[in-house]
Structure formats: structure tokens, C-alpha cells
């Protein structure tokens, strides 16, 4: 068996889903002709050699556009990026790449991306939306770290 | 910068075991793999295993399985091999190095001097 | 366990080209082998020059460029340096472990 990407659409508990606009993943109110983002994910093949109970850990990448999320530290902060990759040559390293790499929870509908660079920080949007997709440790009131991620086959 | 500072020159006898230490700086271990490696006078490398040392799993090469242990210590920023039941086809120069991923690939990108052990009755 | 081959020792003029290859006992390497190359020179820390099999390491000469040439992963070093003078080894994966060559002395005369 050959593994490939999945396929998902993600959308938060406010309904806002992931379009992106300048190289930048933002989370918007769905309107129509709106073109929210598709997900491609896949599991890491070195899944013994990560944490576990931690999550799935999975890369993480935008569908046919050869992006994909990373974690990296702008000073002492991690910050989320997109980076010109593709999901496939992450998934068939020698070695998981932790900087592209979210240990991805389920709890019911709810899934959360935790950050296996820097374990802690969640992939989260602002309450108060129409803002970038950021990396945060405050699980509260001001960023929403639960998605609803529906797989499309 | 980056350096790998391993401990000195050993001298054991059959049956023993022995422990090297990798000082990493300039650098968090945590943020990387450590491997290691062994070369035996006149001989080509030898991929002993590897530490993550962010949460300590490990993988060796099925000959060094239970006679390689690695570990670390990050809050010295330190990776150890230890070779236990010590026979002289282990005398040999074991090298610690940084398994770095840059870009597009995974690179040994920074080596440690090496550590020779002498197995000798 | 697979076993892997290099040149035990080659030769090339300052200037020239050389190509040192590493041969895995299993078949042809492919890209999925993500071959790896590190330089020792005498008296010298290793240093990596190429991962991935064709991904040069940070601050390698772009005179060191690596590839697959006839089921094998190679080396090659255009326009040779006296400096260059050292022992190449190559390492393949396979699947969860690393197999070195038993490297190839490189003389520059």
C-alpha cells in the first residue's frame, strides 16, 4: 500500500474556517464563494519513536499547494508558519521532523494540533476572528484551540 | 557555537563496561538527534544508534541492541553511550554527532572529537 | 544486514573531477536510502556534506554535489582542492537503521 495524504476541512466551534490570504492562514466567518482551505494530513512513520498518549502525531499541510505548517521560534516565541514543502518528503524523511509535526487529540468532534517541537503550544485562532492562525499555551477564553476537522473521502 | 566536547580516552578490561559523555554547546539537544557512531582501527564507521533527547526514545542497530545504551541529561546539555560486557572487538574510536535537520534534509552536521576505549587484559 | 561499498581509495588531479560511489548489497540505492556523505580529514573533526542524497549541508563548497549514477549513490568533487584531500564515507538508510561504507581515501596529486 502506497500511504497518501487524507483529505479534511477544519472549521472551529464558531464555524470560522481556514482560508488562506498572503501566505498566511486566517480564520474567517464561511460566507458564500468563499474558498476555505483543504487540509492534507498524514501520520508520522516514525510514530514509535514519538511520544506517547500524546496524540496522533500527524504533518500537517494545505492540498495541492505544497504548504505546509511548521512551528518555529521567532526569539523565545514559536510562532506558526506556512513553508513551501511537501507533505510527502516530511513523511518519508529517515527521521520525524518535529518542527512539522502536531501530535493531533480527539475528543468527540473536537480535535486539537498540539506542537511536537514545542510541546504545550496548541495551533489556535483568536476569539475574536479574521486573525492568522497563531501557536499559543493559553488554553482560556481568548483563542480557540478545538477544530472540528471532517475528513472528506 | 556549536561544539561536541566528549570525555577522554579509556582503557578497560573484558567484561567491563564503559561510559562516554557529549558535551553539546551552543545548541539545545533537546532540539535535535544525537547519534553515534564507532570506528575500529583500520575499519570504516559504525552506526551504533541514536537519542532523541527531547523525550529520550532511542533506535540502535540490531548489533548494538543490549550491548549500547544510550541516555541523555538535558539539564547538562549531555548525551552518554554506555557499552557494557566489554570484548576486545569493541576497542574502537566512538564518535558522538549532531543529526540536524536544515531545509530540505537530515545532515551530520557537527561531530564530537571521539572518545577511544581500549579492551585489554 | 545490508551491506554497503565504497572505493577503498581513488585519485584525481587539483583542478580535476573525481566521483566516489556507494553501492548497497540489496539492490539499487534509491532516494528512499537518503544517502548521507561525511568528509574526515586528518587531525580533523568530521564534517557532513550531503543528506538526503543530493541536499548539501550548510556552508559546503558547491563544488562537493551528490546524486544516484547507475543504481549507486555518488559523490562528486569538480574542480578538486589540495584541501580536499581526506576520507569520504557514505551511509544509506534502511528503513529504521543506517549502514556506513567502509569509506574511500581520496588522494589529490
Known amino acids: 500500500k502506497i500511504d497518501t495524504p487524507q483529505r479534511g476541512s477544519i472549521q472551529d466551534i464558531n464555524h470560522r474556517v481556514w482560508v488562506l490570504q498572503d501566505q498566511t492562514l486566517i480564520a474567517v466567518p464561511r460566507k458564500d464563494r468563499m474558498s476555505p482551505v483543504t487540509i492534507a494530513l498524514i501520520s508520522c512513520r516514525h510514530v514509535e519513536t514519538l511520544e506517547k498518549d500524546r496524540g496522533n502525531p500527524i504533518y500537517l499541510g494545505l492540498n495541492g499547494l505544497n504548504l505546509c505548517l511548521m512551528c518555529a521560534k521567532v526569539g523565545d516565541q514559536p510562532t506558526l508558519q506556512l513553508k513551501e514543502k511537501d507533505i510527502m518528503d516530511l513523511y518519508n524523511q529517515p527521521e520525524p521532523v518535529k518542527s512539522f509535526l502536531f501530535y493531533h487529540s480527539q475528543s468527540g468532534r473536537n480535535s486539537t494540533f498540539e506542537s511536537v517541537a514545542f510541546p504545550g503550544w496548541f495551533i489556535a485562532v483568536s476569539s475574536e476572528g479574521g486573525c492568522p492562525l497563531i501557536l499559543t499555551q493559553e488554553l482560556g477564553k481568548a483563542n480557540t484551540t478545538d477544530f472540528g476537522l471532517t475528513m472528506l473521502f | 557555537q556549536v561544539q561536541l566536547v566528549q570525555s577522554g580516552a579509556e582503557v578497560k578490561k573484558p567484561g567491563a563496561s564503559v561510559k562516554v559523555s557529549c558535551k553539546a554547546s551552543?545548541?539545545?539537544?533537546?532540539?535535535?538527534?544525537i547519534y553515534w557512531v564507532r570506528q575500529a582501527p583500520g575499519q570504516g564507521l559504525e552506526w551504533i544508534g541514536r537519542i532523541d533527547p527531547a523525550i529520550g526514545t532511542t533506535r540502535y542497530d540490531p548489533k548494538f541492541q543490549g550491548k549500547a545504551t544510550l541516555t541523555t541529561d538535558t539539564s547538562t546539555n549531555t548525551a552518554y553511550l554506555e557499552l557494557s560486557s566489554l570484548r576486545s572487538e569493541d576497542t574502537a574510536v566512538y564518535y558522538c554527532a549532531r543529526y540536524d535537520y536544515s531545509g530540505s534534509s537530515f545532515y551530520f552536521d557537527y561531530w564530537g572529537q571521539g572518545t577511544l576505549v581500549t579492551v585489554s587484559s | 544486514q545490508a551491506v554497503v561499498t565504497q572505493e577503498p581509495s581513488l585519485t584525481v588531479s587539483p583542478g580535476g573531477t573525481v566521483t566516489l560511489t556507494c553501492r548497497s548489497s540489496?539492490?539499487?540505492?534509491?532516494?528512499?536510502?537518503?544517502a548521507n556523505w561525511v568528509q574526515e580529514k586528518p587531525g580533523q573533526l568530521f564534517t557532513g556534506l550531503i543528506g538526503?542524497?543530493?541536499d548539501r549541508a550548510p556552508g559546503v563548497p558547491a563544488r562537493f554535489s551528490g546524486s544516484l549514477l547507475g543504481g549507486k549513490a555518488a559523490l562528486t568533487l569538480s574542480g578538486a582542492q589540495p584541501e580536499d584531500e581526506a576520507d569520504y564515507f557514505c551511509?544509506?538508510?534502511?528503513?529504521?537503521?543506517?549502514?556506513f561504507g567502509g569509506g574511500t581515501k581520496l588522494t589529490v596529486l
Open positions: 538526503g542524497t543530493n
Open positions: 551511509a544509506l538508510w534502511y528503513s529504521n537503521h543506517l549502514v
Open positions: 540489496t539492490g539499487a540505492v534509491t532516494t528512499s536510502n537518503y
Open positions: 551552543g545548541f539545545n539537544i533537546k532540539d535535535t538527534y
